[in-house]
């Protein structure tokens, strides 16, 4: 039902007005105005940026709009010293550097302001020593290098090709390993699918191009200098050797033309097996060190990054809700790039814009949707989420208490194949019946639905007839509203065909090359991918905002906490004389999982018939919807990751972009077997058992009858 | 009280199609996993499938993965088995059961009274 | 082949008391709540048992339900001529993501 008769509005302010007021031009112009020059975090022209869209965001009707700002810490190459990595021979010549720049694309040769390619907030430092290749720089390569390869990483420089895991996770395990500096590389194999053009001339990467990103490993904390609280104007910062999350040893990223150079001469050992080999024509030797002629020769890295303090701003847009006010719904996207941001965020942005505009038009002709909706422009996403995790802790208490659901908006495609889903169990029913009335724009489904097109093409590993929708990892926006604060969150894009482009993201990501260009020549012509992602987010957003019975759906929580469980029993499993030994049970977690399936059944008989006429009662049913989420959220954390305190969900300890399922189970068991201590280690399995089936149980409560 | 009535059975030739129905009432039918359960002559029970409430996720016994599928239209209460490529083997009273517990299958507290698909030439 | 197994038959006079096990594995039995089932001649199943050991309502208590480790076992008290049926003990399995049943248990009254 819509809510039509509760805000009493003209029935022609349904969905279908808000849908088709978006259009497809108009995403494109604005992508077009968003991409001309960079937009980095903290310049001044990512402040006028967000000056542009607040003034514009006003125009289109919003009831306010507001820049909230915070001072992190960033990182930024020093312009006079620029950073690089050099082969050294036995007197200490530079006798090979790598590059200090991408070729600019074709007419942005003039454009002034591009950053170098680096990796954010690495520590200063010139280490130089031999090479040893790590692979994807992955715990199981580590694992396959230490334990089986007996080759040790201590004291020598890594160099590990970029993909399968976010960056920083890789530069964690190295510094775990004793490394004293890595190197990031793009190898073809991971960022040039074959059978097309690198760009300007098709979407791959050139050997020039270098993927820039952060290396940190915040775990939910935000700026790393005031975690867990605002980065105001009264902020206490922490020194920065108590900072959290920073790299001790020095990064830099290079592309495959460079990488080539190096990687071609490495000696030692072979790679253990073809899952170790790129595209490039070199051994991939291991290592450690130079090959024969070249041993006496060294790797030596420059770096001279610096890290300060700078403002950032994020932009806030208010649509006051009719009915319930205090109930917040948000759709948030960043605004700051690398570069030119043709993708990431830009082609996000722009869509959040016509979204804007399409909800202003509709207020201007005297419709407001039930709930108020928030619209958020972020800051510095690419220096580790921090506008949108600043924000939050400074409305921390706001969002508890009002925080409906966040759905994130950064780059709209990464592909142009099908779409992409990952979100919140108590979504999945709002995002099938959603696509189930918007129309596929994809090649051979004319006049069929997107969840046709959708589940043809990515359909669910477990259950068939249905469209695969991921777990929420982070290395996003959402990050804090899901993980921190519980709030139901999701996010929608068009992707790639992940069965034949096993490349990791998309070729040119966080490189000079995310070009409007790009976009508009190679990816989505007639932006129709990108309306089509429009369609979805501002549908989901227009639902969860305007629907009297919130759109969520326990029981599908319920279908998928038993999966979890079936799953992480069988991890367990795989350690029988041990679960016997230290008298490890998951009875009280599967009672917990049963004790929520039958409640939330019950919940849901109830929700089909009460009297949705009682404002009181209404207000009730959908309290409980709302909070269920909250309910999953453990006041202390998980274990050394105090900002991630969802119980069924949790980025992954090995890497940030995947989520994992009873994260705290699942670490306790993690590489169990090679504990020191193994009854301290099943105790704490036990422990977490015990968190996990208290916490399931306690959120199975909220659903039952209140007296 | 609770109902479950099958219909849709019969004869069909291997490899042919035979699509079940379950009309459920006296219940909430979309809070509730739903089971289809055979039993060929003179043998044991065999679980076929189950699809859970809410969105409806499936699930398949290994004997008629890619070629059964099971539906719900959870406003007109009715349960579906979609039955493609039949086997002799396949021959059996098939009942429709619902879950005792809620969205997922748990144990089976009611059932239908069964409708006998056979296949053969 | 079913994951669960039970005695073919067992037998006893009238009044007597009988038990039928049903044998699984960590993955069924050993994480998962078991049921049985009654089946009298040329009827539908009839639930008897849910969560190990719980009687739906109109179930007498002479039967009762147990579950230890990776076994089941259903007991039968005061043995009458109307329990004469097919018993089948049912539950989840973990690694498969699917029900299973018991081979099922015939049991006669002497």
């Known amino acids: 039902k819509s809510s039509n008769e509760a805000t009493n509005i003209t029935p022609k302010h349904n969905m279908k007005a808000f849908l088709d007021e978006l259009k497809a031009e108009n995403i494109k112009k604005f992508l077009y105005n968003f991409t001309q020059i960079p937009h980095l975090a903290g310049t001044e022209q990512n402040f006028q940026l967000a000056k542009q869209i607040q003034s514009q965001w006003k125009e289109f009707g919003l009831d306010s709009v507001e820049l909230a700002h915070y001072d992190v810490l960033l990182s930024y190459p020093n312009k006079t010293h620029p950073n690089y990595i050099s082969i050294i021979n036995e007197d200490g010549n530079e006798i090979f550097n790598t590059s200090l720049f991408e070729p600019p694309p074709p007419g942005y040769e003039n454009v002034s302001d591009i950053v170098p390619p680096f990796s954010a907030f690495s520590p200063q430092g010139m280490p130089e020593g031999d090479l040893v290749y790590v692979n994807y720089a992955r715990t199981e390569d580590f694992f396959k290098l230490e334990r089986d390869m007996k080759i040790n990483c201590s004291g020598k420089i890594v160099i590990a090709r970029y993909g399968k895991v976010f960056r920083g996770n890789k530069v964690k395990n190295a510094q775990l390993a004793g490394a004293k500096g890595v190197i990031l590389y793009s190898d073809p194999a991971d960022y040039f699918a074959p059978g097309v053009k690198s760009y300007p001339d098709g979407w791959n990467l050139p050997g020039g191009g270098v993927q820039r990103g952060n290396i940190l490993n915040l775990n939910g904390a935000g700026d790393p200098l005031t975690p867990g609280y605002p980065a105001n104007e009264y902020a206490y910062r922490r020194g920065i050797a108590e900072a959290v999350g920073l790299p001790s040893i020095p990064v830099h990223p290079i592309g495959y033309y460079d990488a080539q150079k190096l990687l071609e001469k490495m000696g030692g050992s072979a790679p253990p097996d073809s899952s170790w080999r790129g595209s490039l024509k070199v051994p991939y030797n291991v290592g450690p060190g130079f090959t024969g002629n070249f041993s006496t020769q060294k790797v030596k890295m420059h770096i001279h990054s610096t890290n300060e303090v700078t403002r950032i701003y994020n932009v806030i847009g208010t649509l006051r809700g009719a009915v319930e006010p205090d109930r917040y719904v948000i759709l948030g996207g960043h605004r700051d790039s690398w570069v030119f941001g043709g993708i990431d965020p830009q082609s996000g942005a722009a869509v959040v814009h016509e979204i804007v505009r399409s909800f202003g038009t509709l207020k201007k002709e005297g419709w407001r949707p039930r709930r108020t909706i928030l619209f958020a422009s972020w800051d510095a996403e690419e220096f580790g989420l921090l506008g949108s995790t600043e924000w939050a802790e400074e409305n921390s208490r706001l969002l508890q208490e009002r925080g409906v659901a966040y759905i994130n908006a950064d780059s709209s495609i990464e592909g142009n194949y099908t779409l992409r889903v990952d979100c919140t169990p108590l979504m999945y029913s709002l995002v099938h019946n959603l696509t189930k009335e918007l129309k596929s724009p994809d090649e051979g489904f004319e006049g069929k639905s997107l969840y046709e097109s959708w589940t043809k093409k990515s359909p669910s590993p477990e259950f068939s007839g249905m469209p695969r929708i991921s777990k929420l990892g982070s290395g996003n926006d959402f990050e804090v509203f899901f993980q921190r604060l519980g709030i139901a969150s999701g996010r929608a894009r068009y992707t790639k065909n992940w069965e034949t482009n096993k490349f990791s993201g998309y070729p040119l990501y966080h490189s000079v090359y995310e070009t409007y260009e790009l976009v508009e020549k190679f990816y989505d012509p007639m932006f129709k991918y990108h309306l089509t992602v429009a369609q979805v987010r501002g549908g989901m957003v227009f639902e969860l905002a305007n629907s009297i019975v919130l759109p969520f759906d326990c029981r599908d929580y319920a279908v998928v906490l038993r999966k979890y469980a079936d799953k992480i029993y069988s991890i367990s499993m795989k350690h029988p004389q041990e679960m016997k030994t230290y008298s490890v049970s998951f009875d009280s977690l599967f009672s917990a999982v049963k004790n929520f399936t039958e409640i939330a059944s019950k919940f849901s008989e109830r929700l089909q018939d009460f009297d949705k006429s009682n404002p009181i009662v209404l207000r009730m049913m959908n309290d409980q919807l709302m909070f269920l989420e909250r309910a999953f959220i453990d006041p202390l954390g998980l274990p050394d990751r105090p900002f991630y305190r969802h119980v069924i969900y949790a980025p992954s300890s090995h890497n940030k972009y995947a989520g994992e399922s009873f994260p705290g189970i699942y670490d306790a068991l993690f590489d169990i077997e090679s504990k020191v201590d193994p009854s301290k280690a099943w105790g704490e399995v036990k422990r977490q058992i015990y968190v996990a089936a208290f916490t399931v149980q306690a959120a199975a409560e909220t659903l039952s009858e209140v007296a | 009280e609770v109902q479950l009535v099958e219909s849709g059975g019969g004869l069909v030739q291997p490899g042919g199609s035979l699509r079940l129905s379950c009309a459920a009432s006296?219940?909430?039918?979309?809070?509730?996993?739903m089971s289809w359960v055979r039993q060929a002559p003179g043998k044991g029970l065999e679980w076929v499938s189950a699809i859970s409430g809410g969105i409806g996720s499936t699930y398949y016994a290994d004997s008629v993965k890619g070629r059964f599928t099971i539906s719900r239209d959870n406003s007109k209460n009715t349960l579906w088995l979609q039955m493609n490529s039949l086997r002799a083997e396949d021959t059996a009273v098939y009942y429709c059961?619902?879950?005792?517990?809620?969205?997922?299958?748990?144990?089976?507290?009611?059932w239908g009274q069964g409708t006998l698909v056979t296949v053969s030439s | 082949q079913s994951v669960l197994t039970q005695p073919p038959s067992v037998s006893a006079a009238p009044g007597q008391k009988v038990t039928i096990s049903c044998s699984g594995s960590?993955?069924?039995?050993?994480?998962?709540?078991v049921s049985w089932y009654q089946q009298l001649p040329g009827t539908a199943p009839k639930l008897l048992i849910y969560?190990?050991?719980k009687r739906p309502s109109g179930i007498p208590d002479r039967f009762s339900g147990s579950k230890s480790g990776t076994s089941a076992t259903l007991g039968i008290t005061g043995l009458q001529t109307g329990d004469e049926a097919d018993y089948y003990c049912g539950t989840w399995d973990s690694s498969l993501s699917a029900y299973v049943f018991g081979t099922g248990t015939k049991v006669t009254v002497l």
């Open positions: 960590s993955s069924n039995i050993g994480n998962n709540y």
């Open positions: 006296g219940f909430t039918f979309s809070s509730y996993a």
């Open positions: 059961a619902k879950d005792g517990v809620g969205a997922t299958p748990y144990y089976f507290d009611y």
């Open positions: 969560d190990n050991n």
